[in-house]
């Protein structure tokens, strides 16, 4: 009996095509993904091939102004046109706490959505009943298909899950339910997940019983053959796992954004074991035109789009100053906005311990492109905001050595003068240059705001403390020069996009005013 | 080979009385969320009435709602589905369905996602 399992994650509110590199389509010959699209390919496969199961594995929310507008009405209304069979919760499906996740998504979804190591209690137990479940049996042809779920249990440090729901540890939740199912007589299960590559591994090796496993977070790309496009394969598509009970286990994850999607045929036996897998990412190039009537639906959805980019969100009763002559050279109080909203939005009284789990904000003075003018009324759009962060990034949360950051902080300034873009912003961090002195040896202070105490305060980085850093996805990556930044970090976590970052943080605040403060110094 | 088998269907005028039964081979119905669906000639299929394994609550359309009662036997692997108080517009063929994923009875009911198991049907004409 064969299987064919399509699937996507971390599409994170790509429902129109995109330009290669997943920001805003520019030219429409050359751009790729979108609902769609996504359609059109999805049905041609369901027509041609008997036994097909559309899946998602999370992190359908946060990523663009489709989000900001909508809060996830959009995912429910177009993942439904599109027939999902089933979805994992990720993390960020709690950005907007567990209400943004039951009103727009949980109720309108006409597919289950899944999460075994997830569970309610309190009073959000009896409300949220039914709503989520750790496994739904499908029907697939003259068989049944048992999917179960799994999320990031790093999801209350990453996101808004509120103190109702409890993450438990992945493997320990999955193994009670795979176990379920077996007795049920369910001989097919595919574990489907927002954890990251590497737990996709572990859940393919110790969990018995789990026969796929369909994954994301990670944005992981596999790929067997020559990649299509940019994305770098970390390994073959599917990639094979032996488990501890010595059965092959096909592991998959479809990179991200919409760009592909992810093909992978499985035949089971008549036990439900695993024969062969095999398939690809497909890229969703405009070789495969956009469904006319999706298509029609995207752009009545648009027009509320166009309307709330001009819409105030906040007033400034300063210049925000984001000018290259400024933000390139020294501190500048655009950056210092910027960076501001960023802790704020990564607040998360977790432990009594800390007052917050992360303090500190790096920010590359390049991504930083425009300045706004307090003298139109102070107003402040998402329009305003767009220019200042056109590039369509996340504000990640990364877990660094003291060593990499002073190596950071010494690539701000190898070259200094020269207008480049890699001059550092920041936010819970006080660095002092001499650029008197050699480069690579060019910081001479460089205090950073303790999380571990009651009233913050700022002491000497030490190089060989592990610390939690928010910044750029372009900088995680290792954009602008920072190669130690990608090649040290300990951790990485996709976070939220940047503009809705800003934008939320100036709603809040309602009325800004930014000011150079000594962050960052020269002796 | 797992089986749901619907018995019980028949001819009964306008305020009669049947019971359905649903009979489970290959599997044991306590663990699952089991429903009674109807199609009539030309219209959608409908969720009638559901039950759950765990908890045994119940689901009713209004259409039937006092007029209906659904019950299960676990020792027989059997559920029932009491018709009382038949209308014409009763009439249609009448399916169990059988999931045994945690979901609740009225989701089950809708039906709110697709349902694994299907009996073949049995027809109840009220004329």
């Known amino acids: 009996w064969e299987l064919t399992i399509l699937h996507t994650n971390d599409v994170h509110s790509r429902l129109e095509q995109t330009s290669e590199d997943s920001s805003k389509c520019v030219n429409a010959s050359r751009c790729m993904g979108g609902v769609a699209r996504l359609f059109t390919k999805v049905q041609q496969i369901r027509r041609a091939e008997p036994n097909v199961l559309l899946l998602d594995a999370g992190d359908q929310y946060q990523g663009t102004i489709w989000f900001t507008v909508y809060k996830g009405a959009e995912v429910a209304h177009f993942m439904n046109a599109l027939r999902y069979d089933a979805m994992a919760l990720g993390n960020h499906e709690f950005d907007n706490g567990v209400e943004g996740l039951i009103e727009p998504l949980l109720k309108e979804a006409k597919f289950p959505i899944l999460s075994a190591n997830i569970k309610a209690k309190g009073p959000l137990a009896s409300q949220i009943s039914g709503l989520y479940l750790p496994y739904k049996v499908l029907p697939v042809g003259d068989e049944v298909v048992g999917i179960v779920g799994y999320t990031s249990k790093e999801t209350p440090f990453l996101s808004n899950p509120g103190t109702n729901l409890v993450f438990e540890d992945e493997i320990t939740a999955l193994q009670p339910e795979v176990d379920k199912l077996k007795t049920l007589n369910v001989n097919k299960i595919i574990a489907l997940g927002h954890s990251g590559f590497e737990m996709d591994k572990l859940i393919a090796q110790k969990v018995r019983g789990v026969d796929v496993v369909v994954g994301g977070h990670s944005n992981t790309f596999l790929y067997t053959g020559n990649p299509p496009s940019k994305e770098v394969p970390a390994g073959k598509y599917p990639f094979i796992v032996t488990s501890d009970d010595g059965r092959k286990v096909p592991v998959v994850q479809a990179y991200a954004f919409g760009k592909y999607l992810g093909y992978l045929k499985i035949e089971f036996d008549e036990r439900g074991n695993v024969i062969s897998s095999h398939g690809n990412p497909i890229l969703l190039n405009s070789s495969i035109p956009e469904d006319p009537s999706i298509k029609a639906d995207i752009n009545k959805w648009r027009i509320k789009l166009d309307n709330y980019s001009t819409q105030e969100l906040g007033k400034t009763i300063v210049y925000l100053d984001g000018s290259s002559q400024s933000c390139r050279f020294r501190e500048c109080n655009m950056g210092n906005l910027i960076c501001d909203a960023m802790i704020n939005n990564n607040l998360r009284h977790t432990d009594e311990m800390f007052w917050n789990h992360v303090s500190m904000c790096i920010l590359n003075g390049g991504g930083i492109r425009s300045p706004i003018d307090e003298r139109n009324n102070g107003t402040i759009t998402w329009e305003n905001l767009a220019a200042v962060l056109p590039f369509g990034g996340t504000f990640d949360l990364v877990q660094l050595k003291g060593s990499t950051l002073k190596k950071a902080f010494e690539h701000s300034v190898h070259r200094y003068g020269q207008s480049t873009g890699e001059f550092l912003q920041v936010g819970g961090i006080h660095v002092v240059y001499d650029l008197s002195r050699k480069p690579g040896d060019r910081v001479v202070k460089l205090d950073v705001l303790c999380t571990k105490c009651r009233v913050p305060s700022y002491d000497p980085l030490k190089m060989d403390e592990v610390y939690k850093v928010i910044l750029p996805n372009f900088l995680a990556n290792g954009g602008d020069g920072f190669q130690m930044i990608k090649d040290e970090l300990l951790r990485h976590d996709s976070g939220d996009q940047d503009i809705n970052v800003v934008s939320t943080y100036i709603s809040k605040m309602k009325v800004i005013y930014p000011a150079v403060e000594g962050r960052i110094k020269f002796s | 080979q797992r089986q749901l088998v619907e018995s019980g269907g028949g001819l009964v005028q306008p305020g009669g009385s049947l019971r359905l039964s649903c009979a489970a081979s290959?599997?044991?119905?306590?663990?699952?969320?089991i429903g009674w669906f109807r199609q009539a000639p030309g219209k959608e299929r409908e969720g009638v009435s559901c039950?759950?394994?765990?908890?045994?609550?119940?689901y009713y359309a209004d259409s039937v709602k006092g007029r209906f009662t659904i019950s299960r036997d676990n020792a027989k692997n059997t559920v029932y589905l009491q018709m009382n108080s038949l209308k014409p517009e009763d009439t249609a063929v009448y399916f169990c369905?059988?999931?045994?994923?945690?979901?609740?009875?009225?989701?089950?009911?809708?039906?709110?996602?697709?349902?694994?198991?299907w009996g073949q049907g049995t027809q109840v004409t009220v004329s």
């Open positions: 290959g599997f044991l119905l306590d663990y699952y969320v």
């Open positions: 369905a059988a999931d045994p994923s945690p979901v609740t009875v009225q989701a089950m009911c809708l039906p709110r996602f697709p349902v694994p198991y």
């Open positions: 039950i759950s394994g765990s908890d045994r609550s119940t």
